[in-house]
Interface confidence: low
């Protein structure tokens, strides 16, 4: 279920799957929520540690048991991912951090009158992920009112420094507040060029697009269908970017589908989950559990309830069934996508709905340790 | 890798290809990404090629034939070879590479967890070796990253098989009695990873062996757990941030 409590002065020991810099525990928790394997996180505010390299450190953690030992660490904040927390799941992060400089690649500098205007510029720039703004009282006069638009390879700052009269924050594109707008079109038999930022296996172009939308550096994608001529590239979803923000060229190519990230959509973003069930398809991955259930929908529910489960295959093979119940294979992978997609099988596959934010989780056991 | 199969995308996201660009460019060794700016490999990969600017490090790749002049690569900022390694010996066959620029972690480019210092109690039963090395003794570098599941062999058993070498406690061996599956030339420096409690750990660094996949001649790997102090000392004392391991 959904666990929203934060543990103050506590640090989860071990289980690291990734580390990054974040300005606060909530943003760290959001990164944990959207990380395919993160169940727990620990965050080190600037005040909690002398080691400059670990200040603002956000440690994303996994555990086969769903928990890790907590050790006392003054100032540290730990908690759970919000996977399975329904409407609380959001990539939107509006906070502005005063006295903090979030470092990254500065690709645009302009003079603006307020931090809000700087945030708006970031939100309306296709490549901007976060920003820093030097206020009117910044110690170097020539930098005052400078708005620095930034990006980084992982979408999070490469470093965070305490710096007076500087304010920082994130793009509000995940809040559906971008003025850019988005291309909803899906282009059949067209392949985009440019730089691949990641490669995953997906059953269709729509899953590919959703993954692109939530990938920090994906602006557009090309999906190779299951009848693509090169067997090893079938069902490959290539997440792409370019300097300009749009594909520099596109090539007519049978059995490919291309499209754009929907992160710049003005209204609502697609949910960060995939609810469709794919008949006759087997999703390969690491086996988490095998259970007998009645029907593919129950299999999907079972996967959704088991927090580490990312996707499933429900087998209808006679040897996998007992009366009305058949084997439900609960699976996971390093990146949340199947490691293999096979067709023509007796069964169906699909994804966990743990990141669907329409889920009604009324049990919000929000609790922080006493101060 | 002898007796292996093709890997799939993102299966071994810590695997990197160490390539040398002289007149031509070729893959020489594997390596393991252990932090944004750190790769762990074998010291012997640098025998005769200690110049860091001739090396190119490709991460997040599956197929070497996909590499073009436009494929991004990392360059070396620093090569740290274990102070006790000698070209003429097999001991301390371990080296750290500090990259000039930190790598972002993606689905296909992520670090491997390191074992606990002096990890001797864990019984690893699910171990894999990966690389683009030869698929037979007199073979050639493979295009697609290969993987092979190989059981660990006790040091006592390994010493019997290599009577004219010293198999130290800082080495770990893996192989089948009947041979057939093993690392080979070009896999050196790459990972021997074992899955325990759902987590992959870097147990060994491909180091040496008598031929490849020969009967009763297991592969010999540098035991990473025995070098944790050294790894942490070097990654944390070097300027720039080390892998952000949980300080707890």
């Amino acid at each position: 279920g959904c666990l929203t409590q934060l543990y103050e002065n506590a640090f989860f020991r071990g289980g690291d799957v990734a580390s990054m810099y974040t300005p606060n525990a909530q943003y760290c928790q959001m990164r944990c929520t959207f990380h395919p394997r993160c169940l727990l996180f620990s965050f080190l505010p600037a005040s909690s540690i002398n080691d400059m390299e670990k200040r603002f450190g956000c440690f994303l953690k996994d555990s086969v048991t769903g928990t890790l030992p907590k050790v006392h660490r003054t100032g540290a904040v730990s908690g759970h991912s919000l996977k399975q927390c329904g409407h609380q799941i959001s990539a939107c992060h509006r906070d502005i951090y005063k006295g903090v400089d979030m470092r990254g690649v500065n690709f645009n500098v302009s003079k603006v009158s307020s931090v809000e205007e700087c945030q708006k510029r970031c939100t309306s720039n296709i490549r901007c992920q976060f920003f820093s703004y030097a206020t009117q009282t910044f110690h170097k006069a020539e930098y005052r009112n400078n708005c620095l638009l930034k990006y980084s390879p992982g979408g999070t700052p490469t470093a965070i420094k305490v710096l007076s009269n500087v304010e920082s924050g994130f793009s509000l594109k995940p809040c559906a507040l971008s003025e850019i707008g988005c291309h909803m079109n899906i282009f059949q038999h067209l392949a985009f060029s440019d730089v691949d930022v990641a490669r995953v296996l997906t059953p269709d172009a729509f899953v590919c697009r959703t993954i692109c939308t939530y990938h920090p550096n994906c602006l557009f994608f090309t999906f190779y269908t299951n009848v693509w001529k090169i067997e090893s590239q079938r069902n490959v979803c290539l997440l792409k970017t370019s300097e300009s923000g749009t594909p520099s060229s596109s090539t007519p190519q049978e059995n490919t589908i291309s499209g754009y990230s929907l992160l710049t959509c003005k209204r609502t973003l697609p949910e960060p989950c995939h609810s469709k069930i794919y008949p006759g398809v087997d999703f390969g991955g690491e086996e988490l559990n095998v259970t007998f259930v009645k029907g593919v929908n129950v299999c999907q529910e079972t996967c959704t309830k088991m927090i580490r489960c990312q996707f499933f295959t429900y087998s209808l093979l006679p040897e996998d069934c007992k009366e009305e119940k058949c084997k439900c294979f609960l699976r996971l992978s390093m990146d949340g996508s199947p490691t293999r997609i096979a067709y023509g099988t007796q069964g169906s596959s699909g994804y966990s709905l743990r990141l669907c934010n329409t889920g009604d989780n009324s049990v919000c056991t929000t609790k922080t340790s006493t101060r | 890798i002898v007796g292996g199969t093709n890997s799939s995308w993102g299966e071994w996201p810590w695997q990197v290809s160490l390539q040398v660009k002289l007149t031509a460019q070729r893959h020489l060794c594997g390596g393991s990404l252990i932090g944004h700016q750190w790769v762990l490999t074998a010291a012997h990969c640098f025998d005769g090629l200690p110049l860091q600017d001739v090396w190119r490090i490709y991460s997040g790749i599956l197929n070497l034939s996909d590499i073009t002049k436009d494929t991004p690569f990392s360059q070396i900022k620093e090569i740290i070879i274990h102070q006790n390694y000698k070209v003429s010996e097999g001991n301390h066959d371990i080296a750290l590479i500090k990259l000039q620029a930190p790598l972002n972690y993606t689905e296909f480019q992520k670090p491997i967890c390191l074992p606990s210092k002096g990890d001797t109690s864990t019984i690893y039963t699910n171990c894999w070796v990966t690389g683009w090395g030869f698929s037979k003794e007199k073979g050639e570098i493979q295009n697609i990253l290969q993987k092979v599941n190989i059981p660990l062999v006790t040091n006592e058993e390994c010493q019997k098989r290599y009577q004219d070498y010293k198999i130290t406690q800082r080495m770990v061996c893996a192989g089948y009695k009947e041979g057939g599956k093993d690392a080979c030339k070009g896999d050196s420096g790459g990972p021997l990873v074992c899955k325990h409690n759902g987590m992959w750990r870097l147990v060994g660094i491909t180091s040496w062996g008598e031929g490849c996949a020969r009967r009763e001649q297991p592969g010999v790997y540098t035991k990473v757990a025995e070098y944790m102090d050294w790894i942490l000392e070097k990654t944390q004392s070097s300027d720039g941030k080390a892998q952000m391991q949980s300080p707890a």
Epitope: - | E89, D164, K166
Partner: antibody, heavy 122, light 106 residues
Framework: EVQLLESGGGLVQPGGSLRLSCAAS????????MMWVRQAPGKGLEWVSG????????VYADSVKGRFTISRDNSKNTLYLQMNSLRAEDTAVYYC???????????????WGQGTMVTVSS | DIQMTQSPSTLSASVGDRVTITCRAS??????LAWYQQKPGKAPNLLIY???TLESGVPSRFSGSGSGTEFTLTISSLQPDDFATYYC????????FGQGTKVEIK
């Protein structure tokens, strides 16, 4: 400087025993395989026995198996060859040699002592 | 056991000559072969290991070749210091020496 110095050779009657020693210096003795190789007067080289670094593994040529015992004392940097039931055909110069453990190459006997003469005669 | 057969047993040559000694293994030993030089009353001296790798400090006129069962030691231009007995040795399975080749002055 790397050095190996054999001692303990001499004249012994058939059926008798002799213990050869080889004192090592200039290298980490405990890391290396050590060998005894012999050469009968006017003849070629014959490998006799080898012992691995820990001392746990010993190997012998068929001609001496069951009669000779190789051992080492790593704390004293010394190699030994206990020779029992000696025969006339064991008469030879006995060399101790060490073989650097080379990885992945396999090196051969690089360093040799000057030899000690063993004569088995009645 | 692996037997090593050297030929010729004796070789007469002059300074400046190119000299070739062959060594045959009774079964394949890959490249695990070494060549030694021995002078009267002295211990052997390693010249070449792994069939063709020159030991450090050995003059470049010495070279080795071969793999499997057939091996060759070549002295490109015989020098006065090279008159000695030469032994091959396999180290694929334990160790066996050839019977030696004596290179003498013609």
């Amino acid at each position: 400087e790397v050095q190996l110095l054999e001692s303990g050779g001499g004249l012994v009657q058939p059926g008798g025993s002799l213990r050869l020693s080889c004192a090592a210096s200039g290298f980490t003795f405990s890391h290396y395989i050590m060998m005894w190789v012999r050469q009968a007067p006017g003849k070629g080289l014959e490998w006799v026995s080898g012992i691995y670094s820990s001392g746990g593994i010993t190997v012998y040529a068929d001609s001496v198996k069951g009669r000779f015992t190789i051992s080492r004392d790593n704390s004293k940097n010394t190699l030994y060859l206990q020779m029992n039931s000696l025969r006339a055909e064991d008469t030879a110069v006995y060399y101790c040699a060490y073989r650097r453990t080379g990885v992945p190459r396999r090196d051969s006997f690089e360093i040799w002592g000057q030899g000690t003469m063993v004569t088995v005669s009645s | 056991d692996i037997q090593m057969t050297q030929s010729p047993s004796t070789l007469s040559a002059s300074v400046g000559d190119r000299v070739t000694i062959t060594c045959r293994a009774s079964q394949s030993i890959s490249s695990w072969l070494a060549w030694y030089q021995q002078k009267p009353g002295k211990a052997p001296n390693l010249l070449i290991y792994k069939a063709s790798t020159l030991e450090s400090g050995v003059p470049s006129r010495f070279s080795g070749s071969g793999s499997g069962t057939e091996f060759t030691l070549t002295i490109s231009s015989l020098q006065p210091d090279d008159f000695a007995t030469y032994y091959c040795q396999q180290y694929n399975t334990y160790w066996t020496f050839g019977q030696g080749t004596k290179v003498e002055i013609k």
